[in-house]
Interface confidence: medium
């Protein structure tokens, strides 16, 4: 079951999965000036079998200037940017990825990848926060988040965490002892707060134009 | 032709902010349905080659609409034009109702 | 590529509908109904999986290049056309659509 939406944005903060979930997707996306080749894959697909997981189809990006050539090398690490999504900006090591059953290693990068890496998720994963540089970790409770399915309803839960503008950086995921707060609203697995995601969606004309349109809307 | 098509769609019952992708998709009378286009709330796109020098997609999250813009339009281009959410791995659920959209010169 | 272009079949008889990809899709591809006037609706996707609300006379299977969707026992509201999707390679595209109508 994929999650209804993006893990939840935390001021200052950034987040990693340490391991993907099978069924996760990650897009297949191209920079400024590269587009997926004809007949390219959409995105990757964590899948496995009994015996490991690993990720199905190959993103590829040839120029758009350019027609029938692709390359799938492996960037240089200078040409690695930062990957607004989930990539962190200090390193990591807590979670052996290759331990944990039913998970992806993180995708190798390729070559000419967008900046932004737009994963899907699926219930169960869980994700990990970390201050950005120039930002310290004041923890309320865990600094991750976890898809889960309530009532039907997909949800993740709150991070527990506040990056305060002091010039220290914490490490990964956060070596400060959690401090028990009166603010922090712990999550509850009871209580359903009752919402519709029965998505409706409609048309309307945004502009005349030039030459004459004429429009009729279905009903 | 020097037109330029534009057409919102609107969002209810849940956020344009939500893991999906927000789609464009036409279809000329009697003929099968052409996709066109999407957007992800980051702003992230993507375009069908045969138009992409043609088409923007846009994405308004405070109004949880997002648009479509076609430039120089011709009679080719005279088509129903559906938005739809599309969900990575099971394809387009719901639609909008559907624009007709006549270009004539 | 779908076929056959138009089917025609009498109420309460079994329908089937066919995709060919022109390279494997694995099972990324969807089924949809358009009746006249109307939004197309998500029958199935992921090549088998009902969509939410859609009736167990509804089946689809197949994997790499080959697809069927079987309705199997079409009722009055069943006649429509229906297009199959393939989502996994770029750009995502649609098939020319089955038209199954009244015999």
């Known amino acids: 079951e994929l999650c209804d939406d993006d893990p939840p944005e935390i001021p200052h903060a950034t987040f990693k999965a340490m391991a993907y979930k099978e069924g996760t997707m990650l897009n297949c996306e191209c920079k400024r000036g590269f587009r997926r080749i004809k007949s390219g894959s959409l995105y990757m697909l964590c899948t496995g079998n009994s015996s490991h997981s690993s990720w199905d189809n190959q993103c590829q990006c040839t120029s758009s200037a350019t027609r029938n050539t692709t390359k799938q090398v492996t960037p240089q690490p200078e040409e690695q940017k930062e990957r607004k999504t989930t990539e962190m900006q200090s390193p990591m090591q807590p979670v052996d990825q290759a331990s944990l059953p039913g998970h992806c290693r993180e995708p190798p990068p390729w070559e000419n990848e967008a900046t932004e890496r737009i994963y899907h998720f699926v219930v169960g994963q869980m994700v990990y926060y970390q201050c950005v540089q120039g930002y310290r970790a004041l923890h309320r409770g865990p600094a991750e988040s976890v898809c889960k399915m309530t009532h039907g309803k997909t949800r993740w839960t709150q991070p527990q965490l506040i990056c305060t503008g002091e010039m220290e950086t914490s490490q990964f995921p956060g070596e400060e002892k959690p401090q028990a707060s009166p603010e922090g609203r712990p999550e509850s697995e009871t209580s359903c707060l009752v919402t519709t995601t029965d998505f409706q969606i409609q048309t309307e004309m945004a502009a005349t134009m030039e030459t004459s349109i004429f429009t009729t809307e279905y009903q | 032709p020097s037109g330029t098509l534009s057409l919102t769609c609107a969002v209810s019952?849940?956020?344009?902010?939500?893991?999906?992708?927000w789609s464009w998709v036409r279809q000329p009378p009697g003929k099968g349905l052409e996709w066109i286009g999407e957007?992800?709330?980051?702003?992230?796109?993507n375009y069908n080659p045969s138009l992409k020098s043609r088409v923007t997609i846009s994405v308004d999250k405070s109004k949880n609409q997002f648009s479509l813009k076609l430039s120089s339009v011709t009679a080719a281009d005279t088509a129903v034009y559906y938005c739809?959410?599309?969900?990575?791995?099971?394809?387009?659920?719901?639609w909008g109702q559907g624009t007709l959209v006549t270009v004539s010169s | 590529t779908q076929s056959p272009g138009t089917l025609s079949v009498s109420p309460g008889e079994r329908a089937t509908l066919s995709c060919r990809a022109s390279?494997?899709?694995?099972?990324?591809l969807a089924w949809y109904q358009q009746k006249p006037g109307q939004a197309p609706r998500l029958l199935i996707y992921g090549a088998s999986t009902r969509a939410t609300g859609i009736p167990a006379r509804f089946s689809g299977s197949g994997s790499g290049t080959e697809f069927t969707l079987t309705i199997s026992s079409l009722q009055s509201e069943d006649f429509a056309v229906y297009f199959c999707q393939q989502y996994t390679n770029w750009p995502q595209t649609f098939g020319q659509g089955t038209k199954v109508e009244i015999k």
């Open positions: 390279q494997s899709v694995s099972s990324r």
């Open positions: 019952g849940g956020s344009i902010s939500s893991s999906n992708w």
């Open positions: 739809a959410r599309g969900v990575r791995g099971t394809g387009f659920d719901p």
């Open positions: 957007i992800y709330h980051s702003g992230s796109t």
